[in-house]
C-alpha cells in the first residue's frame, strides 16, 4: 500500500515531500563539514564530531539523540617508534626501507594526525626472511603454491596484493601457510584504472598511496574482548592471548613504488600463469628469495602497533511512529573514518545527515512515521564493525522482538557508472518499485527513471528486464543485524562499471586521498549520484517505516531458495560416487523449498485480502513478515562462527566482503576431496543438509496460518 | 612560483665542516625527494646524496659516505647538507634538486634546480 494511507498523515506529507527536501546542495556541504580533518576512531576528533552529529540531529527535530559508548579493543602506530620494512644485506645493514608515511594532498600538508599507513591489530615483532609472493593470497593462491608448485611458506614473510578478498582473509591463509609476516600492497592492476590520472590530478593511487585497514578473523564477534556481550562499564575482558581474530603474525601495507622495491629482486619460480602477474615492471616471481645477485639480501619487518581498550561513541537517533512506536526501522552507518574519509564513510554519513534532515522538516510540519525509525552513526567501523556490534548486542532483545529492517549507509559511491544493491530478498520488490519512482542520473537517461538505466548498465543474470541484486555478505555495519539477529537488511550505493574496471573497490580507497577534492572534482561535481543514493535509502526507509503493510515479499524468497538449493546440488554432484557410497540426499531441502513456495504464495495471496482496518489482523500479518528473516536463525550458529547464524546467507569463509548461500552444506563440501576421513566429512555434508531443510522448512510454518 | 635557494657555500679548511642549506618555495618539501648535486670546476655533474620525502631513504655517493649528511625539516620547508671532514676534492658548485615524482622512493630524474651555492676547500 502506498505510504499516504498510513495513519496522521496528510496528502501533503508523503513519499513525495520527503524526497523533495532532500537537496544536492546539502549534501555536498555536509561532505565538506565532515571530512576536513581525521576522524579516527577512539579520538578526540571523532567524539567532537558525534557531539557535533547529536547536536545537529537534535536541531532537525528527533524527539532524542543519545551518545552509546563502549570501550573496545583498538589499535594504533607507536608514534615514536614508526613501522617499516627493510631489506637488509648480509651484514644485517638496511639498505631499503618503505615509506613511512604517504606525500600529503595538496592543502593538507599541515594538518596534524594523519594515521600513517598500518594493519590494525597487527602484532608487533621484527621477523626476518626471505620472500614469497603469494598473488592475492587468497586460498586457491595458497593451493596453487602449496600443492602444483610446491612451494612452501613455512617460516618466510608474504607479499600479497591487495584485492578479490577481504584482507584479513589474506593474513588468516598466510598464518595458516607457515608464514611468519605478511606485506600487503597495492598492485596499478587493481588500483590504477588505465586512461586515468593519478591523485590529485585524477582518482587513480598514486605510487606513494596505501590502503589501511584491519586484518582481524572476528566472525561477527564484534570487540574482540567481549564476544556476545557489549563492552560496558562492568564488562568481564578477555586477556588478549583469548581474544577473538586477532592475527598472530607481523603485518604491513605498502604502496606499489615501495612494492617494486621488494618485488623486482625476486626470484625462485617464475608465476604459474599470467594470472598472477600485476601491472608492476617486475617479474612477478614467485619465490622464494632474491634472485642471485641478492640472494644474500633479506626483508626484515619492524611494527611496533600496540592495541588498546579505547572508549568509541555512537550517536542514536529516534524518532517515535505514531502507530506501531514497537517497530524499528533503522537506518545506520559510520563515521569513523581512516584519515579524512571522503568517501568512505563520509559520503554516506553526509546522506544519512540530509535524510534526517528532511525526515526532520517533515516531523516539524505535524507528520510522524507509522513506525519508528532510529538513526545510527557507528563508530569503530574500520577496526571490525564493533559500534554497530556492541550497540546491537547491548540492545538484542529489543532488536530481535522489534527491529524490521535495518538499511546501512556507508559510502555512497564507489564509481558513478549505476546503482548496486544487496539486500535480502524480502526487500526486492520495494526496492524494484521505488527505482521505478526516482529519476535516473544518468547522462543519456534524462526522463527515464533509476530502475531502467540501473537494469540498463546491470542487468539480472537470471531474469531478463530486471536488475542485478546482490547477496548481502560482510564488511559493514548491516553484519549483526542481518547475520546475528536475522533483520531484514540492505544496502545501496552508486558504482563504478565492473565490466570495464577490474580493479578492486575504488583506487584510492582508505589511503590519505580520500578527500572532499576528490568526490567534488572527479567522481559527482553535482552530486546528483549521491542525492539519488539519497533517495533510494531514504525511499527504502520511509516506506518501511510508513506503509501500512510491511513492504516484504516473501515470494522472492521463495524463488532464491530453490536457485540456492540447485546451485549447492550441482556443487555436491561434483562427487557422485561419493553421494551415493554415504547415501547423501538433498531430497529434504528440495521438499522444504517447495513446502516454503507453495506457504509463501497462500500467505501473499492472504496478504492481498485481509481486513487492513483490522488493526489485530494487521499487526499479526505483518509480524509474520517481521519475523520471516528471524526464522532463518539458528541458535546454535554456523560450525566454529557462533555469531553468524542466518542458515541462508553468511559472510564467504574465503571472502568476508562476499556474501555466501547455504554456507553450512557449502563450507563442509568445500575441498572434501582433501579431507583426511572422508566418512567423517561427509556425515557433516548430510547434517548441514538436515540443518538447512529443517531451518526452511521451520521458516515456511512461520507463514502458515496461525491456527 | 617553484623555485630552490641554497645557501652557507664558502671558503673552508681541510677537515673542517659547513652545512648547506636549501629554502624550498612553491611546493611542499613533505611530498619530494630531494638530492644534493655538485660540479667541481671545469667537470661535469656529480650526484652527492639524496633523501625520500618521508626521511627513510638516504642514498650517498661512494665518495661522501660517512662524511656527509642530508636532511630535511618539513616544518621548514628547507634541506640541509651537513658536510664534515672536508676535502680538496669536495670544491664545487653545489646544487640542491627536486625530484620529479611525488613519493619516489630512490633518485629520479630532477625537475627544479636551484641556482647553485660555491664551496671551496682550501688551506
Known amino acids: 500500500k502506498s505510504s499516504n494511507e498510513a495513519t496522521n498523515i496528510t496528502p501533503k506529507h508523503n513519499m513525495k515531500a520527503f524526497l523533495d527536501e532532500l537537496k544536492a546542495e546539502n549534501i555536498k556541504k555536509f561532505l565538506y563539514n565532515f571530512t576536513q580533518i581525521p576522524h579516527l576512531a577512539g579520538t578526540e576528533q571523532n567524539f567532537q564530531l558525534a557531539k557535533q552529529i547529536q547536536s545537529q540531529w537534535k536541531e532537525f527535530g528527533l524527539d532524542s539523540v543519545e551518545l552509546a559508548h563502549y570501550d573496545v579493543l583498538l589499535s594504533y602506530p607507536n608514534k615514536t617508534h614508526p613501522n617499516y620494512i627493510s631489506i637488509i644485506n648480509e651484514d644485517g645493514n638496511e639498505i631499503f626501507n618503505t615509506s613511512l608515511f604517504e606525500p600529503p594532498p595538496p592543502g593538507y600538508e599541515n594538518v596534524s594526525d594523519i594515521v600513517p599507513p598500518f594493519s590494525a591489530f597487527s602484532p608487533q615483532g621484527m621477523p626476518e626472511g626471505d620472500l614469497v609472493y603469494v598473488n592475492y593470497a587468497r586460498t586457491e593462491d595458497f593451493f596453487k603454491l602449496e600443492r602444483d608448485m610446491k612451494i612452501n611458506c613455512s617460516g618466510k614473510i608474504v607479499i600479497a596484493r591487495y584485492g578479490k578478498v577481504f584482507r584479513g582473509n589474506k593474513v588468516k591463509n598466510a598464518q595458516l601457510a607457515g608464514a611468519k609476516g605478511v606485506i600487503l600492497y597495492s598492485d596499478p592492476a587493481d588500483y590504477f584504472a588505465p586512461g586515468v590520472k593519478s591523485y590529485p590530478d585524477g582518482w587513480n593511487l598514486p605510487g606513494g598511496g596505501v590502503q589501511r585497514g584491519n586484518i582481524l578473523n572476528l566472525n561477527g564477534a564484534g570487540d574482540p574482548l567481549t564476544p556476545g556481550y557489549p563492552a560496558n562499564e562492568y564488562a568481564y575482558r578477555r586477556g588478549i592471548a583469548e581474544a577473538v581474530g586477532l592475527p598472530s603474525i607481523p603485518v604491513h601495507p605498502i604502496g606499489y613504488y615501495d612494492a617494486q622495491k621488494l618485488l623486482e629482486k625476486m626470484g625462485g619460480s617464475a608465476p604459474p600463469d599470467s594470472s598472477w602477474r600485476g601491472s608492476l615492471k617486475v617479474p612477478y616471481n614467485v619465490g622464494p628469495g632474491f634472485t642471485g645477485n641478492f640472494s644474500t639480501q633479506k626483508v626484515k619487518m619492524h611494527i611496533h602497533s600496540t592495541n588498546e581498550v579505547t572508549r568509541i561513541y555512537n550517536v542514536i537517533g529516534t524518532l517515535r511512529g505514531a502507530v506501531e512506536p514497537d517497530r524499528y526501522v533503522i537506518l545506520g552507518g559510520h563515521r569513523d573514518s581512516w584519515v579524512f574519509g571522503g568517501i568512505d564513510p563520509q559520503s554516506g554519513a553526509a546522506v544519512v545527515h540530509e535524510i534526517v534532515r528532511s525526515f526532520g522538516t517533515l516531523k516539524k510540519e505535524g507528520w510522524r512515521p507509522r513506525r519508528t525509525i532510529l538513526f545510527a552513526s557507528w563508530d569503530a567501523e574500520e577496526f571490525g564493525l564493533l559500534g554497530s556490534t556492541e550497540w546491537a548486542e547491548e540492545n538484542s532483545r529489543l532488536l530481535q522482538e522489534r527491529g524490521v529492517a535495518y538499511i546501512n549507509a556507508d559510502s555512497s559511491i564507489e564509481g558513478n557508472y549505476t546503482l548496486r544493491v544487496d539486500c535480502t530478498p524480502l526487500m526486492y520488490s520495494l526496492v524494484h518499485n521505488l527505482t521505478k519512482e526516482l529519476k535516473s542520473p544518468d547522462e543519456g537517461f534524462e526522463g527515464k527513471s533509476l530502475y531502467e538505466s540501473w537494469t540498463k548498465k546491470s542487468p539480472s543474470p537470471e531474469f531478463s528486464g530486471m536488475p542485478r541484486i546482490s547477496k548481502l555478505g560482510s564488511g559493514n555495519d548491516f553484519e549483526v543485524f542481518f547475520q546475528r539477529l536475522g533483520i531484514a537488511s540492505g544496502r545501496a550505493r552508486y558504482t563504478k562499471n565492473w565490466e570495464t574496471n577490474k580493479f578492486s573497490g575504488y583506487p584510492l580507497y582508505h589511503s590519505v586521498y580520500e578527500t572532499y577534492e576528490l568526490v567534488e572534482k572527479f567522481y559527482d561535481p553535482m552530486f546528483k549520484y549521491h542525492l539519488t543514493v539519497a533517495q533510494v535509502r531514504g525511499g527504502m526507509v520511509f516506506e518501511l517505516a510508513n506503509s501500512i503493510v510491511l513492504p516484504f515479499d516473501c515470494r522472492d524468497y521463495a524463488v532464491v531458495l530453490r536457485k540456492y538449493a540447485d546451485k549447492i546440488y550441482s556443487i555436491s554432484m561434483k562427487h557422485p560416487q561419493e553421494m551415493k557410497t554415504y547415501s547423501v540426499s538433498f531430497d529434504s531441502l528440495f521438499s522444504a523449498v517447495k513446502n516454503f513456495t507453495e506457504i509463501a504464495s497462500k500467505f501473499s495471496e492472504r496478504l492481498q485480502d485481509f481486513d487492513k482496518s483490522n488493526p489485530i489482523v494487521l499487526r499479526m500479518m505483518n509480524d509474520q513478515l517481521m519475523f520471516l528473516e528471524r526464522a532463518f536463525i539458528d541458535p546454535l550458529g554456523l560450525p566454529d562462527r557462533p555469531f553468524y547464524r542466518h542458515v541462508i546467507y553468511a559472510p564467504s569463509s574465503h571472502n568476508k566482503y562476499a556474501g555466501e548461500s547455504f554456507p553450512g552444506i557449502y563450507d563442509a563440501l568445500f575441498d572434501i576431496e582433501s579431507k583426511v576421513d572422508p566418512s567423517k566429512a561427509w556425515g557433516e555434508v548430510k547434517r548441514q543438509i538436515y540443518v538447512a531443510a529443517f531451518t526452511v522448512q521451520a521458516a515456511a510454518e512461520t507463514l502458515s496460518e496461525v491456527a | 612560483e617553484v623555485q630552490l635557494v641554497e645557501s652557507g657555500g664558502g671558503v673552508v679548511q681541510p677537515g673542517r665542516s659547513l652545512r648547506l642549506s636549501c629554502a624550498a618555495s612553491?611546493?611542499?618539501?613533505?611530498?619530494?625527494?630531494m638530492n644534493w648535486v655538485r660540479q667541481a670546476p671545469g667537470k661535469g655533474l656529480d650526484w652527492v646524496a639524496f633523501?625520500?620525502?618521508?626521511?627513510?631513504?638516504?642514498y650517498y655517493a661512494d665518495s661522501v659516505k660517512g662524511r656527509f649528511t642530508i636532511s630535511k625539516d618539513n616544518s621548514k620547508n628547507t634541506l640541509y647538507l651537513q658536510m664534515n671532514s672536508l676535502r680538496a676534492e669536495d670544491t664545487a658548485v653545489y646544487y640542491c634538486?627536486?625530484?620529479?615524482?611525488?613519493?619516489?622512493?630512490?633518485?629520479?630524474?630532477?625537475?627544479?634546480w636551484g641556482q647553485g651555492t660555491m664551496v671551496t676547500v682550501s688551506s
Open positions: 634538486a627536486k625530484d620529479r615524482i611525488v613519493g619516489a622512493r630512490v633518485p629520479d630524474a630532477f625537475d627544479i
Open positions: 633523501i625520500s620525502y618521508d626521511g627513510s631513504n638516504k
Open positions: 612553491g611546493f611542499p618539501l613533505i611530498s619530494y625527494g
